[in-house]
Every structure is written in structure tokens, then in C-alpha cells.
């Protein structure tokens, strides 16, 4: 019986010779559990596992802890890959995180973190980031040191408010912090002075809700 080839991330898929961007099946480390992900094989050398994407507001990102844990949406469009998978993947190997952003005026920018990982669920999928470079701000729009993840039904922020309910979407809220890429999607000309939009402060400032975002990870030794 031939053993099925499994891949833990899009970098392994790329190195296997499959170099076309699209949806692929990934397998949890040390498990048979599978998840479908979008692999970007074109951006900056390829091999990127997309863990978040926003582009048109077609998917509701005001979801529960369980939904953010397991993932939701469609890898061909707007989606969240899942905190549990990303946590397991990044805890066993050194990954970089690239965040690609688009505004409504036709500009693009990115933030690249040279080391990214999520703690496990027992630590509320706390985000850990070091080594910021890129064009989307010299200061990290994800609060440092990293915050715990919060959702509408699991409030783990440092605010007297409930950031996830106030700003919408699950995110690594501080109190509430300079970013929220899972906020409410606003169309062009309705995207300024928003208290709950898709925010990356150190690129576009406060109240500006972005047109598109992609968060993607790749092994640092790719």
C-alpha cells in the first residue's frame, strides 16, 4: 500500500514541485487532521501559507472563539485558517510572518516579522513577533509584547471594555491597540473615521479601513 504524501505547509508543497498558487490540503503536525489553505506560490519566492485574507466583505469575521480556533471562510476568498493549526505549526519550527496590505487609493505596503509564533490555546493563542521590517510602518501595529487573542465570546484583552465586541472581529487586542485586520469591512468612500474597521495604524493612521489584507507565513529557512 502506497503511503499518502502529506504536507505541513505550503513551503513543503512548493519544494515538492507543486508551484502553482491555489488551494492545497495541509496536515496538522503529528496528526492526521487536515486543513485546506491557500498557498501563494508567486509572492516573493513562493511557499507562503495564507492564514488570513480580506478583500470584499463577503465573509463575516465577527465569529466565536471556536470558529477562530478551527478556521472559517473560503481559502479562495476571505478566510481565517485557524488558530489551532497555526499554533501547532509555528511552535515546532521558526516561521516568518508577512502582512500584505492594500488601501483604497491604489497603494500597497507590507510588514514582515522575522519570527512569528502563536502560543497554545491554554495561553489564548498569544502572538509572539520579533524583527519588524517593511513599508507598512516602522513601529509594529500589532502591540508589543504580544497580546492574547480575543473574540466576541472570549475577552482576553487589557481594556476595561470588550475590544472584540466594540471593534468587531477576533484579534490580538491590547486596549484595544493599533490594529485589527479582522474588523468590519467598509467599502470605498465609507472607509474613514471608522471605530471598528480594518485598521493598521502605523501605515494608514486611525480610522482608516483598508481595502484588502493578507497574512501569510513561511519557514524562516525556506
Amino acid at each position: 500500500k502506497e503511503e499518502k504524501t502529506t504536507f505541513r505547509d505550503c513551503a513543503e508543497i512548493f519544494k515538492s514541485g507543486l508551484t502553482t498558487s491555489g488551494i492545497y490540503t495541509l496536515t496538522f503536525p503529528n496528526s492526521t487532521e487536515e486543513v485546506k489553505a491557500y498557498c501563494d506560490m508567486d509572492m516573493g519566492g513562493g511557499g507562503w501559507t495564507v492564514i488570513q485574507h480580506r478583500e470584499d466583505g463577503s465573509v463575516d469575521f465577527q465569529r466565536t472563539w471556536k470558529e477562530y480556533k478551527e478556521g472559517f471562510g473560503s481559502p479562495l476568498g476571505e478566510y481565517w485558517l485557524g488558530n489551532e493549526f497555526v499554533s501547532q505549526l509555528t511552535s515546532g519550527h521558526r516561521y516568518v510572518l508577512k502582512i500584505q496590505l492594500k488601501d483604497w487609493e491604489g497603494s500597497e505596503a507590507h510588514s514582515l516579522y522575522e519570527h512569528f509564533y502563536l502560543s497554545g490555546e491554554e495561553s489564548n493563542y498569544r502572538i509572539h513577533l520579533t524583527g519588524l521590517t517593511g513599508t507598512a510602518g516602522k513601529i509594529s501595529s500589532i502591540s508589543q509584547p504580544g497580546s492574547d487573542f480575543s473574540t466576541k465570546d472570549s475577552d482576553n484583552d487589557k481594556c476595561i471594555c470588550k475590544c472584540s465586541q466594540m471593534l468587531t472581529g477576533g484579534w490580538w487586542f491590547d486596549a484595544c491597540g493599533p490594529s485589527n485586520l479582522n474588523g468590519q469591512y467598509y467599502p470605498q468612500k465609507q472607509n474613514t473615521n471608522k471605530f471598528n474597521g480594518i485598521k493598521w495604524y502605523y501605515w494608514k493612521g486611525s480610522g482608516y479601513s483598508l481595502k484588502a489584507t493578507t497574512m501569510m507565513i513561511r519557514p524562516a529557512d525556506f
Epitope: C159, I160, C161, N193, S206
Partner: nanobody, 129 residues
């Protein structure tokens, strides 16, 4: 739609006074804190003063304490900044901005600039003889 409109700026001599107004629409002042910020040419935008109407609490930057007074008129949904004893270094574009009053870190009294998500277009204050 949230809108903030500043007015009252202008040219004033050192030692003079001005009163800036920030007319707010689309939100009620009871639920928000309103801050005044300023930005001089080539410098970072900095916080000047802020007010939470619901609790009546106020904040002032050290550089304006004793000279500037912030107040609000909830019936007019307007916040004012009375500026006395003006100095050349007060020259800047002055902006008002809004933040939900509850968006506060445990143990803190005021808000970092990135929490203010709604901004006006600004009004220019020039202090010169």
C-alpha cells in the same frame, strides 16, 4: 457618519487668546472622549488636551497646563479649547478627534493617539507678532 469640524483658528499675537470649537455629529459626547491634538510643520502630531463628558474628567499636556482649558457643551455636541497666554511654539494645525470612552487600558486615565479613530480636518493657529 461621524464628523468632527474644527473652527476658531487664526493669527494671534504672543500673549493673546483664542477659543477653538469642535462640532461633533454622528455620535453623542456622553459615550466618547474628545481630544485636541496639534501638529507643527515637520513635527509629530501631539496630544494637547482631552475630555470625557460623561465623567467630566480632563487631561492636559504639561506644555499647556494652566494656559489651556477644555470644556464641552453636550446640548450643542461641541467641545471647546480655550487657549490663553499663547506662545510662538503653540503655532500648529489643531485637530479634534474622538474615541469611545470605554476604550481604556486597566489602570490608565487617557488614551494613546492610535485609539482616536475619528478626526476633523484641522484649524490653523499662528502665534506671531
Amino acid at each position: 457618519e461621524v464628523q468632527l469640524v474644527e473652527s476658531g483658528g487664526g493669527l494671534v499675537q504672543p500673549g493673546g487668546s483664542l477659543r477653538l470649537s469642535c462640532a461633533v455629529s454622528g455620535i453623542t459626547l456622553d459615550d466618547y472622549a474628545i481630544g485636541w491634538f496639534r501638529q507643527a510643520p515637520g513635527k509629530e502630531r501631539e496630544g494637547v488636551s482631552a475630555i470625557r463628558s460623561s465623567g467630566g474628567s480632563t487631561y492636559y499636556a504639561d506644555s499647556v497646563k494652566g494656559r489651556f482649558t477644555i470644556s464641552s457643551d453636550n446640548s450643542k455636541n461641541t467641545v471647546y479649547l480655550q487657549m490663553n497666554s499663547l506662545r510662538p511654539e503653540d503655532t500648529a494645525v489643531y485637530y479634534c478627534a474622538a474615541v469611545p470612552a470605554g476604550r481604556l487600558r486597566y489602570g490608565e486615565q487617557w488614551y494613546p493617539i492610535y485609539e482616536y479613530d475619528a478626526w476633523g480636518q484641522g484649524t490653523l493657529v499662528t502665534v506671531s507678532s
